[in-house]
Interface confidence: medium
Amino acid sequence: AHTAAPQVTSTASKLLPPVAFNHTIGHIVLSEHKNVKFNCSINIPNTYQETAGISWWKDGKELLGAHHSITQFYPDEEGVSIIALFSIASVQRSDNGSYFCKMKVNNREIVSDPIYVEVQGLPYFIKQPESVNVTRNTAFNLTCQAVGPPEPVNIFWVQNSSRVNEKPERSPSVLTVPGLTETAVFSCEAHNDKGLTVSKGVHINIKVIP
C-alpha cells in the first residue's frame, strides 16, 4: 500500500506536472436518429489532492439535467484514471455542436479539446415559396432556402411538374418568373448528399382584373 501524499499548497502546485485531458476523437459525423457515444478521459496523479467532478459543456453552456453521462473512476497506485462517458440516443439536428469536458484540479480549471458532433440529414427548408396572386404577364420572384448538414444544398425549381432550371443553384435561390398567363404550381427541390426534399407545391394565381 502507498502512503497518502502530503497536502499540496498553492505554491507547491506550480511545481506539479501539468495535467490535461487525453486526446480523443475530434469530429463525429452521423445521420439523424442514430445513437452516439463519446468520452473524455484524464489521469490524475496522487500528488494532486483537490479534484472536482467532470462537467460536460456544449457550445459554451454547461449540460445539466436530462443528458446521459456517466463518470467512471479507475484508481491504482499512481493515481486515478477518470473516464466521463456521454451518450445521445436518436440524435437530432439540435444536437449539432462542440462538446467538451471541464474539471477543476487544485483550483485550476482544465478544459478538454472539443468534440464536434455533426448530425446530417436531408435538406431542411427554412424558407420556401409562398402562394401569391400575380398580375397576368407581370414578373415576380419566389424564394427557396434549405440547409444541411451536409452542405452544400442545391436547389432545383419545378413548375407544373417540369424542372425550370437544368443546372442547380446553391441555396438560397430566388426564381424570377417573367410572367404567367395562367395559374401554375411551383415547388422547389433541395438536394444534398443525403437525399432530396421537395417543398409543398404553391399555387400562383392570376388576378382577375375587374
Epitope: Q92, G121, L122, F156, S161, D193, K194, G195, L196, V198
Partner: antibody
Framework: QELVESGGGLVQAGESLKLSCKAS????????ISWVRQAPGKGLEWIAY????????NYAHSVKGRFTISSDNAQNTVFLQMPSLTASDTATYFC??????????????????????WGPGTLVTVSS | DPVLTQTPSSVEAAVGGTVTIKCQAS??????LAWYQQKPGQPPKLLIY???TLASGVSSRFKGSGSGTEFTLTISDLECADAATYYC?????????????FGGGTEVVVK
C-alpha cells in the same frame, strides 16, 4: 412491413401487362416506390419511380413514354402498366421502397437515394 | 449521366478470408453510393448506403469506403453465406428527372 408484387406471367410480344405492388405495414404516402427489373442472368435496372403522397413520377430513358407508373393510395398499391411488350422486357420485376427517413416534416416529399425494402419479385416472360 | 463500373466481375476467396470489390463512377457522385447483396432467387438486400453507413441489421464485417469516383466494399472474415452477387448503386438528378443507376455486379464465390 412488406411489399408484394403480382401480375407477371407469360405474354406474346406486343401484348400488355399491368403489374401491382401491394404495400403493407407502411405509411404509403410518405415513401418513394420504384420498379427495378432484372433480366435472366443479368444485372439490376431501375425503370420507374413514384412518390404516392405527392404524385411525383419518374422514368428511366429505356421505358419513358411506354410504361406508366401509378398508385391507388387507398389500396396502398403501386402499378406498372406495360403496353407493347417486347422480348427485351423479359425480366423479374421488383418493387422497392426508399430508405426510411424519420427526420422529416409532414407535408414534404423525401427521396433518400437508396432502396431498403424489396418485394420478392414477379416474373414477366415475353415470347416472340 | 454517371456510369458505375464494378471490378472484378467475379472473385473467389476462402472462408475466413477478405474480399474487396471496387466501384468506379464516371463522374463525381460525392458519397451518394449504396451496396447491395443479392442471392439467387431473392431480391437485393441493402448493405451500405451513403458510401460507408451500415444498413440496419447488417454485419460489421461489411465495410464501405470512398467518395467522389472511387468506392470500395470490403467483406472480411468471409462466411459461406456471403456467396452472392454484389451491386453498387447511385442516384442523380431531381425528384421528377432523377435516375437510379446500378453497377454491373460482382459475383463472390466462397470456397
Amino acid at each position: 412491413q412488406e411489399l408484394v408484387e403480382s401480375g407477371g406471367g407469360l405474354v406474346q410480344a406486343g401484348e400488355s401487362l399491368k403489374l401491382s405492388c401491394k404495400a403493407s405495414g407502411i405509411d404509403f404516402s410518405s415513401y418513394g416506390i420504384s420498379w427495378v427489373r432484372q433480366a435472366p442472368g443479368k444485372g439490376l435496372e431501375w425503370i420507374a419511380y413514384i412518390y404516392p403522397g405527392f404524385g411525383i413520377t419518374n422514368y428511366a430513358h429505356s421505358v419513358k413514354g411506354r410504361f406508366t407508373i401509378s398508385s391507388d393510395n387507398a389500396q396502398n398499391t403501386v402499378f406498372l402498366q406495360m403496353p407493347s411488350l417486347t422480348a427485351s422486357d423479359t425480366a423479374t420485376y421488383f418493387c422497392a421502397r426508399d430508405l426510411d427517413y424519420t427526420g422529416g416534416v409532414v407535408g414534404y416529399a423525401y427521396v433518400t437515394y437508396y432502396f431498403t425494402l424489396w418485394g420478392p419479385g414477379t416474373l414477366v416472360t415475353v415470347s416472340s | 449521366d454517371p456510369v458505375l463500373t464494378q471490378t472484378p466481375s467475379s472473385v473467389e476467396a476462402a472462408v475466413g478470408g477478405t474480399v474487396t470489390i471496387k466501384c468506379q463512377a464516371s463522374e463525381s457522385i460525392s458519397s451518394r453510393l449504396a451496396w447491395y447483396q443479392q442471392k439467387p432467387g431473392q431480391p437485393p438486400k441493402l448493405l451500405i448506403y451513403s458510401a460507408s453507413t451500415l444498413a440496419s441489421g447488417v454485419s460489421s464485417r461489411f465495410k464501405g469506403s470512398g467518395s467522389g469516383t472511387e468506392f470500395t466494399l470490403t467483406i472480411s472474415d468471409l462466411e459461406c453465406a456471403d456467396a452472392a452477387t454484389y451491386y453498387c448503386q447511385t442516384y442523380y438528378g431531381g425528384s421528377t428527372t432523377g435516375w437510379y443507376v446500378f453497377g454491373g455486379g460482382t459475383e463472390v464465390v466462397v470456397k
